[in-house]
């Protein structure tokens, strides 16, 4: 269940997709990736206030218990709901190869 | 890829399954659930230091970028990798019904 998309904390403060530019050095990939040399990394960042983009029943429980026991139970966390594929040109022992990664770049976000 | 299960922060400090006792009132379920009246809620709590239980490539990227830009990119977050089903006896207009929920209780945890 994808709950409310209205952020009570103000525009852009709640869980959403962000793009962060990163070099191969930043990612620790310089030893094995040839291209692309810069990656537009899409990731999920932002707060998860009550029922905002709650992924499922577990997220709703977590919200309730966090309200009761904030020191014990953390608030839900902003994580990928789905991913976009990304193709990398990699070094291999014999030369290079194209490899598709399906779990690398976030496509959509929710709170869990 | 399920990376290292050794917690560098000390025993029990890293992402793992915890059990929290909660009443129907705590969960906000008192109006519609008849049984159980107390739930042993299993949830994922704990820190996600570098490469600890990294769920996938995205988690590894997040770790790298968090190290570089801690104010911009959050560390990976401890969330359920899978769920256990739970049966609730619910009130209905005509009486009661048994309903199975598949996304309610965490079974296993990872960092993402």
């Amino acid at each position: 269940a994808r709950n409310g998309d209205h952020c009570p904390l103000g525009p852009g403060r709640c869980c959403r997709l962000h793009t962060v530019r990163a070099s191969l050095e930043d990612l620790g990939w310089a030893d094995w990736v040839l291209s692309p040399r810069e990656v537009q990394v899409t990731m999920c960042i932002g707060a998860c206030p009550s029922q905002f983009r709650a992924a499922n029943m577990h997220a709703q429980i977590k919200t309730s218990l966090h309200r009761l026991k904030p020191d014990t139970v953390p608030a839900p966390c902003c994580v990928p709901a789905s991913y976009n594929p990304m193709v990398l040109i990699q070094k291999t022992d014999t030369g290079v190869s194209l490899q598709t990664y399906d779990d690398l770049l976030a496509k959509d976000c929710h709170c869990i | 890829a399920r990376n290292g299960d050794h917690c560098p922060l000390g025993p029990g400090r890293c992402c793992r399954l915890h059990t929290v006792r909660a009443s129907l009132e705590d969960l906000g379920w008192a109006d519609w659930v008849l049984s159980p009246r107390e739930v042993q809620v299993t949830m994922c709590i704990g820190a996600c230091p570098s490469q600890f239980r990294a769920a996938n490539m995205h988690a590894q990227i997040k770790t790298s970028l968090h190290r570089l830009k801690p104010d911009t990119v959050p560390a990976p977050c401890c969330v359920p990798a899978s769920y256990n089903p739970m049966v609730l006896i619910q009130k209905t207009d005509t009486g009661v019904s048994l309903q199975t929920y598949d996304d309610l209780l965490a079974k296993d945890c990872h960092c993402i």
Epitope: T19, S35, E38, P85, M86, V87, I89 | -
Partner: antibody, heavy 119, light 112 residues
């Protein structure tokens, strides 16, 4: 199979704008960049810019800034290039091509759209 | 901008002969791992270009092994070991070392 489909031809008047399409099929559209290349009749190849369908981010060769606007519609796996304030210098074949990033070879090309600017 | 100069601008050979064509860059295209960001394309009359060689020496999928790329830094060569009638085309080199991506002026191969 993997392909990029482009309309064969566009005929437009000087001063007008045109929006040409490039429909991807046979591969995950958001996994690859789309590049655009211009070829004037009997001439060589000129890179115009790229679009990253994952983010919508674009980069243009300086020469084409203000001339070309690159967009994508991920729901239909289609990339678009709009050319504005057309003159006879814009008459050319325009190719879309895919690459794994901004710095990668173009392994699949569309057949090209022939743009004729004439009154 | 990086300038690529191809030579000769045209050449005419008989089927079965060996052909070499040159591409010279105004600056080095060599990156860390001994790979150069230089590619070769073949464009037959009335057709779009087709990728032959990428990252200076790697044959694209389905390209016959009579096509070989070599060179490093600023000087590159495309060799066709035994020219076939179907190789009639214009051959372009392209650098993607930096933006803007640039192409050479092309070498037109004619078959006697």
């Amino acid at each position: 199979q993997v392909q990029l489909q482009q309309p064969g031809a566009e005929l437009v008047k000087p001063g007008a704008s045109v929006k040409m399409s490039c429909k991807a099929s046979g591969y995950p559209f958001e996994g690859w960049y789309i590049h655009w290349v211009k070829q004037r009749p009997g001439q060589g190849l000129e890179w115009m810019g790229w679009n990253n369908p994952r983010t919508g981010l674009t980069n243009h060769a300086q020469k084409f800034q203000g001339k070309a606007t690159l967009t994508v519609d991920t729901s239909s796996s289609t990339a678009y290039m709009q050319l504005s304030s057309l003159t006879s210098e814009d008459s050319a074949v325009y190719y879309c091509a895919r690459g794994v990033g901004a710095d990668a070879a173009f392994d699949i090309w569309g057949q090209g759209t022939t743009l004729t600017v004439s009154s | 901008d990086i300038v690529l100069t191809q030579s000769p601008s045209s050449l005419s050979v008989s089927a079965g002969e060996k052909v070499t064509m040159s591409c010279r860059s105004s600056q080095s295209l060599l990156w860390k791992h001994g790979y150069n960001y230089l590619d070769w394309y073949q464009q037959k009359p009335g057709q779009p270009p087709k990728l032959l060689i990428y990252l200076d020496r790697n044959r694209a999928h389905g390209v016959p092994d009579r096509f070989t790329g070599s060179g490093s830094g600023t000087d590159f060569t495309l060799t066709i070991s035994s020219v076939q009638a179907e190789d009639l085309a214009v051959y372009y080199c392209m650098q993607s070392f930096e933006t803007p991506i640039t192409f050479g002026g092309g070498t037109k191969l004619e078959i006697k």
